[in-house]
């Protein structure tokens, strides 16, 4: 669910995950419509899609946890039901995404207004 | 309506080889895993392995390992699982069962008899 | 691999009773999944991740728990509840049952 995200995101990333990606770019945090503003928000939209394949397919996004291991920057996902692996998964995937580029993180997209984004 | 379908399992040799199947209807195998699990008075539930319909991937209980072989054809919707050189301890129910929040639909299970 | 412990073996209820069987297991698991068995019947998914009640099962059923040690509990037993029980384990594999707790109509 969005702790575990939130938590895999700190400990991967070292940064606050809602003051540096809840309102990032046009699809990082609730929603996402327009063009991605850069890496770290092409990020944003591969997990948001990645999540639609996951509710499509029966899990609950917001809500269906998981458990995972962190140890020496390696997020491992634990066993468990189909909607646990693959949610975990996703979750992986982003973190190690939003790691990748946090060089080009932009703080003028940190809060980016919705209204922007087309 | 979620339903799995049941069958291949009959009165068989010692020795012998069979090959269950479970035919999904209202859902794609692919969107979850689908798990074998064997059931007899005792000791009772026993998981047996599973498979990613999607790519093929499969984990197995080491017991039934060599024993056991799970495979999926995405096509027909259909996960197999194959049972070699039967003996008086494969006697069993076998059931297969959909995992996406958990094991939330199982099949009606099939009684395989091995007998000679 | 992870060997779940259900207790009681059997146990018996009157309509109405409050009922509560236990899954204990060998190391800690990060949840616990409950299944409901009746006679000539496939098991059925009643609790997932600990405490979350399967679609279309009575409200009356909860479950609770954490580390090695976990319940399922039906507060008032009806007589549709007569079967047998089953905790499962997904925290390491192989997967693994528990014996069951058969639950029987005083």
């Known amino acids: 669910g969005l702790l575990d995200l939130k938590s895999m995101i700190e400990k991967v990333t070292g940064k606050n995950a809602l003051t540096n990606y809840g309102f990032y770019g046009c699809y990082c945090g609730w929603g996402g419509r327009g063009t991605p503003k850069d890496g770290t928000d092409w990020c944003c939209w591969a997990h948001d899609h990645c999540y639609g394949r996951l509710e499509e397919k029966g899990c609950n996004i917001r809500t269906q946890s998981y458990k995972y291991r962190f140890a020496w920057g390696v997020v491992t996902c634990e066993p468990g039901p189909f909607c646990h692996v693959n949610l975990c998964a996703c979750d992986r995937k982003l973190v190690y995404c939003l790691k990748r580029n946090l060089r080009s993180y932009n703080p003028q997209y940190q809060y980016f207004p919705n209204i922007l984004c087309s | 309506e979620v339903q799995l379908q049941l069958s291949g399992a009959d009165l068989v040799k010692p020795g012998a080889s069979v090959k269950l199947s479970c035919t999904a209807s209202g859902f794609n195998i692919k969107d979850s895993y689908i798990h074998w699990v064997k059931q007899r008075p005792e000791p009772g539930l026993e998981w047996i392995g599973r498979?990613?319909?999607?790519?093929?991937?499969?984990k197995y209980d080491p017991k039934f390992q060599g024993k056991a072989t799970i495979t999926a054809d995405t096509s027909s919707n259909t996960a197999y699982l194959q049972l070699t050189s039967l003996t008086s301890e494969d006697t069993a129910v076998y059931y297969c069962a959909r995992d996406v929040v958990a094991l939330d639909y199982w099949g009606q299970g099939t009684t395989l008899t091995v007998s000679s | 691999q992870i060997v779940l412990t259900q207790s009681p073996a059997i146990m018996s209820a009157s309509p109405g009773e409050k009922v509560t069987m236990t899954c204990s297991a060998s190391?800690?698991?990060?949840?616990m999944y409950w299944y409901q068995q009746k006679p000539g019947s496939s098991p059925r998914l009643l609790i997932y991740?600990?405490?979350n009640l399967a679609s279309g099962v009575p409200v009356r059923f909860s479950g609770s728990g954490s580390g090695t040690s976990y319940s399922l509990t039906i507060s008032r037993m009806e007589a549709e509840d007569a079967a047998t029980y089953y905790c499962q384990q997904w925290s390491s594999y192989p997967l693994t049952f528990g014996a069951g707790t058969k639950l029987e109509l005083k």
């Open positions: 190391s800690s698991v990060s949840y």
């Open positions: 991740d600990t405490s």
């Open positions: 498979i990613d319909p999607a790519n093929g991937n499969t």
